[in-house]
Interface confidence: low
């Protein structure tokens, strides 16, 4: 058990100490049909865009981090699918800093795409406030880009 010693800034709590988790939701054991994935992506796109726009308005002047890479697409499937297990920890991490209703909806949709017993990876987020803001912005930008990419590939393939 890690015990917290002394006062710490918020963010060191969750953002800098994410733990590995096997999701309690029963995720599908097989890949969803493209029509279902498309519905989920359609649901995620406005949520992601809104979250990104809100954050950009609130945090003007924050640059994108060149040290952060969200491995949001699987490399082992064609067309690429959203790597839900890699993305979920980041959204659990930025939950405290965003509209909880939007984040919950995103997590709910990502959970549907997750394979059963697929572990979520542990992440480390910068403790420095400015770097943390930059990290969050980068995650939101990369997630939006990933959704666009998956959406395009779904539209170009069979419906």
């Amino acid at each position: 058990m890690l015990s917290h010693t002394g006062p710490s800034r918020f963010a060191l709590f969750l953002l800098c100490s994410m733990e590995t988790l096997l999701s309690s939701h029963m995720a599908p054991t097989h890949q969803l049909p493209p029509s279902d994935v498309r519905k989920i992506i359609l649901e995620l796109q406005p949520l992601s865009r809104g979250l990104l726009e809100d954050y950009q308005k609130k945090e003007t002047g924050v640059p994108e981090s060149n040290r952060t890479l969200l491995l949001c697409l699987t490399s082992d499937s064609q067309p690429p699918r959203l790597n839900s297990s890699a993305i979920l920890p980041y959204f659990r991490a930025i939950r405290p800093l965003s509209d909880k209703n939007i984040i919950d909806k995103i997590i709910e949709q990502l959970d549907k795409l997750k394979f059963q017993h697929e572990p979520e990876t542990e992440i480390s987020v910068p403790a420095d406030t400015f770097e943390c803001k930059s990290f969050i912005l980068t995650i939101l930008q990369q997630f939006s880009a990933c959704l666009e990419s998956v959406f395009k590939s779904l539209n170009s393939g069979p419906q």
């Epitope: 917290h4 918020f10 969750l14 909880k100």
Partner: antibody, heavy 118, light 111 residues
Framework: EVQLVESGGDLVKPGGSLKLSCAAS????????MSWVRQTPDKRLEWVAT????????YYPDNIKGRFTISRDNAKNTLYLQMSSLKSEDTAMYYC???????????WGQGTSVTVSS | DILLTQSPASLAVSLGQRAIISCKAS??????????MHWYQQKPGQQPKLLIY???NLEAGVPTRFSGSGSRTDFTLNIHPVEEEDAATYFC?????????FGGGTKLEIK
């Protein structure tokens, strides 16, 4: 419907020990951080402990650290608070609280009463 | 520790009027542009209930007559128009830094 039901509160002598339990239902327990908050007889609220959703991370204020231990059993949907070296100032109503996003406490149980007196 | 000072300690407001409760922090409780201040309502014999989270977000199911505002060190809970059922004690709480702390409470009485 989210439900948090505390149990284990009792009258205990100074220096004694007690274990509180909180049975959770109506939500995916293992997806949420959980806390214990107490309310003293003069109605002041005090944060007691917090545990992360998987149980790996625990947090306490200095006056509690080393005496109380927060833990959870996700398979049983249960939160615990093991209290030892109890003092009269630990007399309070103890609430089990669900954490939202780790910084907001959005659902509180009805509480269980702990009295430390000789 | 961050000290939260609520004022007034008690207030009596006529039905339909506005109740304003203040919570001042001994240091900033904002992070990444978000005020990590929350408001709870507690009625006699009941557990606290979340009203407002992160300074200004209305918790689901809470009437829109409740609103929160503020940033950094100064936060306010507004209730307008006040109704009979709003008679309760209101607490602010910060989660910017450990240990999490609460204000001393404000008891609202309806005239």
């Amino acid at each position: 419907e989210v439900q948090l039901v505390e149990s284990g509160g009792d009258l205990v002598k100074p220096g004694g020990s007690l274990k509180l339990s909180c049975a959770a239902s109506g939500f995916s327990f293992s997806n949420y951080g959980m806390s214990w908050v107490r309310q003293t007889p003069d109605k002041r609220l005090e944060w007691v402990a917090t545990i992360s959703y998987g149980g790996s991370y625990t947090y306490y204020p200095d006056n509690i650290k080393g005496r109380f231990t927060i833990s959870r059993d996700n398979a049983k949907n249960t939160l615990y608070l093991q209290m030892s070296s109890l003092k009269s100032e630990d007399t309070a109503m103890y609430y089990c609280v669900r954490g939202y996003g780790y910084d907001t406490m959005d659902y509180w149980g009805q509480g269980t009463s702990v009295t430390v007196s000789s | 520790d961050i000290l939260l000072t609520q004022s007034p300690a008690s207030l009596a407001v006529s039905l339909g009027q506005r109740a304003i409760i203040s919570c001042k922090a001994s240091q900033s409780v904002s992070f990444a542009g978000t005020g990590l201040m929350h408001w709870y309502q507690q009625k006699p014999g009941q557990q606290p209930k979340l009203l407002i989270y992160r300074a200004s977000n209305l918790e689901a199911g809470v009437p829109t007559r409740f609103s929160g505002s503020g940033s950094r060190t100064d936060f306010t809970l507004n209730i307008h128009p006040v109704e009979e059922e709003d008679a309760a004690t209101y607490f602010c709480q910060q989660s910017r830094e450990y240990p999490w702390t609460f204000g001393g409470g404000t008891k609202l009485e309806i005239k």
